[in-house]
Interface confidence: medium
């Protein structure tokens, strides 16, 4: 079920909190853990039985501006002989993340948080077989 | 910062880059998408590198619940349903952005935080190191 938009803000702010207009929040986009690095196994996108390619999407009105999306290279999976086995399926694995969207309305600018679905890689699965009666 | 294309008719005082602090609408676009991977697909069970999903809960974060994948096996499941140790199940990790309240007790003040999550697992050919 989807909850409709609600239009009240009602929290009492402690004295030390920054003043915030109703219906909005203050967001510091200086990222905590900015320098953390992914320590994934080397070249897994090429070594996987469900290999994938990466595409960088770039949007100057989004923060972060670069979002990397994976695309599975094959419909099937790569077998021990290095051939595509179409009895198995390469499928995308997805994860949500937050981005900040910058919107221009005339000369005014507003900011909105947005959930974005990122494809992070692929995995090899046994297909679901639907038997026709 | 990020350069923003600007309407040429607007005053030049507008900052071209994303400012360090922004005022953001409380309504999150696309926020009602399904965030429970157990509901959205059964890939975690059908994969040749299956994984379990662990609930990571932090009430002081948005979203408060994030699902972490842990590979079930070191090897991969072969056509016979057995674990094949000539192949490796490895986690696919992704950096995501979440919100953290900052200062801690201020209701409408937040900061972006980058966290590393394991989203699922994939089956890879191992890197073999030959000892001379």
């Amino acid at each position: 079920r989807k909850i409709p938009k609600v239009g009240h803000t009602f929290f009492q702010k402690p004295e030390s909190c920054p003043p915030v207009p109703g219906g909005s929040m203050k967001l510091d986009i200086g990222i905590i853990n900015e320098n953390q690095r992914v320590s994934m196994s080397r070249n897994i996108e090429s070594r996987s039985t469900s290999p994938w390619n990466y595409t960088v999407t770039w949007d100057p009105n989004r923060y972060p501006s670069e979002v990397v999306q994976a695309q599975c290279r094959n419909l099937g999976c790569i077998n021990a002989q290095g051939k595509e086995d179409i009895s198995m399926n390469s499928v995308p694995i997805q994860q949500e993340t937050l981005v900040v969207r910058r919107k221009h309305q005339g000369c005014s600018v507003s900011f909105q948080l947005e959930k974005v679905l990122v494809t992070v890689g692929c995995t090899c699965v046994t297909p679901v077989i639907h038997h026709v009666q | 910062g990020i350069t923003i294309p600007r309407n040429p008719g607007c005053p030049n005082s507008e900052d071209k880059n994303f400012p360090r602090t922004v005022m953001v609408n409380l309504n999150i676009h696309n926020r009602n998408t399904n965030t429970n991977p157990k509901r959205s697909s059964d890939y975690y069970n059908r994969s040749t590198s299956p994984w379990n999903l662990h609930r990571n809960e932090d009430p002081e974060r948005y979203p408060s619940v994030i699902w972490e994948a842990k590979c079930r096996h070191l090897g991969c499941i072969n056509a016979d349903g057995n674990v094949d140790y000539h192949m490796n199940s490895v986690p696919i990790q992704q950096e995501i952005l979440v919100l953290r309240r900052e200062p801690p007790h201020c209701p409408n003040s937040f900061r972006l935080e980058k966290i590393l999550v394991s989203v699922g697992c994939t089956c890879v050919t191992p890197i073999v190191h030959h000892v001379a």
Epitope: M25 | I28, Y62
Partner: nanobody, 119 residues
């Protein structure tokens, strides 16, 4: 699995009282703000009240202040709404919702309980 189950709704005359309950399970109840929200027939969702994790702070929409009281029992994973001096305009389906740290963001809510105020 997170579950929120409301009860206590019903038909009541104007000026009467009802006590709504919400039984919570599947999450650390004491760690989250909890909300009551309502939806009148043909209307959008309206926030009614919310209560902080430890019950120390409570907030109400102006139209129910002085008439409704929100409370919680963390030992029993339960949320309550005591509704007094009920009016016809309080007629709605009342939902209990689990709050995120963002104000007015609910990630789970119950199936609702109908409150009808009519003579």
């Amino acid at each position: 699995e997170v579950q929120l189950v409301e009860s206590g709704g019903g038909l009541v005359q104007p000026g009467g009282s009802l006590r709504l309950s919400c039984a919570a399970s599947g999450f650390t109840f004491s760690s989250y703000s909890m909300y009551w929200v309502r939806q009148a027939p043909g209307k959008g969702l309206e926030w009614v009240a919310n209560i902080k994790q430890d019950g120390s702070e409570k907030y109400y929409v102006d139209s129910v202040k002085g008439r409704f009281t929100i409370s919680r029992d963390n030992a029993k994973n339960s949320l309550f709404l005591q509704m007094n001096s009920l009016r016809a305009e309080d007629t709605a389906v009342y939902y209990c919702a689990k709050g995120e740290i963002l104000p007015l963001h609910f990630d789970y809510w119950g199936q609702g309980t109908l409150v009808t105020v009519s003579s």
